[in-house]
């Protein structure tokens, strides 16, 4: 049993870190492997994560890691029974993948604009709450070439969109993702799409 691609790990910097790796042949991850993890200092408590299969040879482990601070370094050890397959260190603050923004909704607004609103996935007391910027992707459901990308770099999780910038009578979908610039994070996963019909009158809520 061998590791082909070593674990790649990301933290949401609030409660969970996820590691994914590839074995050199199809593996029943939960039956054959265990990922142990602990803060890297003498005497720290060791925890065990039971991985799940993502594909035949790809394993993924979700580790509850609460109250991460910037200096925290975790030691990760991948075991197949008594055999140590791989050992590595992981610093959550240097491998942040924000949580996915939630509840993306489209409302009609004054002056022929659409108001896109979503929720910041972090509570106000979390470091990342005030660090997030967003990318909104708006695409025409019937025309793959008709899409727009908006970078939302201001604080509020909202975007105003002039209806006139979209084709009248067309169905549009929007989705949003987040990143944290000061943590040099990766992008979050995309939110589920929300769909609406772009027309100018009457202005009803959608």
């Amino acid at each position: 049993v061998k590791v082909l691609h070593e674990p790649s790990c990301f933290s949401d910097y609030i409660s969970t870190s996820v590691c994914q790796w590839k074995m050199d042949h199809p593996t029943n991850c939960s039956a054959e492997l265990r990922l142990s993890y602990q803060l890297d200092f003498m005497g720290s408590e060791n925890h065990t994560c039971v991985p799940e299969n993502r594909e035949d040879s790809v394993c993924v482990c979700s580790m509850p890691i609460d109250d991460a601070v910037e200096a925290d370094v975790y030691q990760l050890d991948l075991w197949a029974g008594q055999q140590l397959l791989w050992s590595g260190s992981f610093q959550p603050s240097k491998h942040v993948k924000p949580r996915t923004p939630g509840n993306l909704t489209v409302y009609p607004n004054i002056s022929h604009t659409w108001l896109l609103m979503w929720t910041n996935p972090y509570p106000t007391e979390n470091h990342l709450h005030s660090e997030l910027t967003y990318m909104v992707n708006v695409s025409n459901d019937n025309d793959p070439e008709d899409f727009k990308v908006y970078n939302v770099t201001y604080m509020g999780p909202t975007l105003r969109l002039a209806a006139s910038t979209l084709k009248s009578g067309a169905s549009y979908s929007a989705r949003v993702r987040a990143w944290a610039q000061t943590y040099n994070s990766t992008w979050s996963d995309w939110s589920p799409s929300t769909t609406w019909l772009n027309y100018y009158e009457p202005w009803e809520q959608h």
């Epitope: 061998k2 050199d24 890297d40 200092f41 003498m42 370094v73 397959l85 791989w86 050992s87 260190s89």
Partner: antibody, heavy 122, light 107 residues
Framework: EVKLVESGGGLVQPGGSLKLSCVAS????????MHWVRQTPEKRLEWVAY????????YYPDTEKGRFTISRDNAKNTLYLQMSRLKSEDTAMYYC???????????????WGTGTTVTVSS | DIQMTQSPASLSASVGETVTITCRAS??????LAWYQQKQGKSPQLLVY???TLAEGVPSRFSGSGSGTQFSLKINSLQPEDFGSYYC?????????VGVGTKLELK
């Protein structure tokens, strides 16, 4: 200048104990995983022990488990190897060595110490 | 454990010659192979890692190649300071193991 300097070697009787030290300078010691590697009189190189950056994890080859203990003091920039129940086969030059990366896929050694000689003989 | 087999055990060459040392792994180690040089009475020094990446400060006359189970270290235009022992080591899986070495002597 990046430097590792070992000390503590010497002549010891079979069954005896010895503690080796390695002082690091010229780099941020706490940023690196560290190892002990030995070279036998026949010039064979053998990996002996590993310790993570913060000292939370240690590993040994099966042959040394239970007899050797690796530890570190990051405040003193010092790596240690406590050896007990020594055998004649443990006679070797002992080197401390640095591995440059975050995981065992990087367990090659980019900086080596000058070495300290351990002789186990009655 | 993965066994590393080096050949030849020793070879003689002259300054200016090109030599090749080979290393075989008992199983697939992809490109996780390092080469070291050790001069008489000195510590080993890293030459190559990941099979072909030269370590910092290593002259370009050294080159590593291979993947899977077969690897080689080539030294072009041998210089007087190149004579000594050479070792290969896999860095794929635990424990890491080292070949018995190749002694390169001046003819």
């Amino acid at each position: 200048e990046v430097k590792l300097v070992e000390s503590g070697g010497g002549l010891v009787q079979p069954g005896g104990s010895l503690k080796l030290s390695c002082v690091a300078s010229g780099f941020t010691f706490s940023d690196y995983h560290m190892h002990w590697v030995r070279q036998t009189p026949e010039k064979r190189l053998e990996w002996v022990a590993y310790i993570s950056k913060g000292g939370g994890s240690t590993y040994y080859p099966d042959t040394e488990k239970g007899r050797f203990t690796i530890s570190r003091d990051n405040a003193k920039n010092t790596l240690y190897l406590q050896m007990s129940r020594l055998k004649s086969e443990d006679t070797a030059m002992y080197y401390c060595a640095r591995s440059p990366g975050p995981s065992s896929f990087y367990w090659y050694f980019d900086v080596w110490g000058t070495g300290t000689t351990v002789t186990v003989s009655s | 454990d993965i066994q590393m087999t080096q050949s030849p055990a020793s070879l003689s060459a002259s300054v200016g010659e090109t030599v090749t040392i080979t290393c075989r792994a008992s199983e697939n180690i992809y490109s996780y192979l390092a080469w070291y040089q050790q001069k008489q009475g000195k510590s080993p020094q890293l030459l190559v890692y990941n099979a072909k990446t030269l370590a910092e400060g290593v002259p370009s006359r050294f080159s590593g190649s291979g993947s899977g189970t077969q690897f080689s270290l080539k030294i072009n235009s041998l210089q007087p300071e190149d004579f000594g022992s050479y070792y290969c080591q896999h860095h794929y899986g635990i424990p890491v193991t080292v070949g018995v070495g190749t002694k390169l002597e001046l003819k």
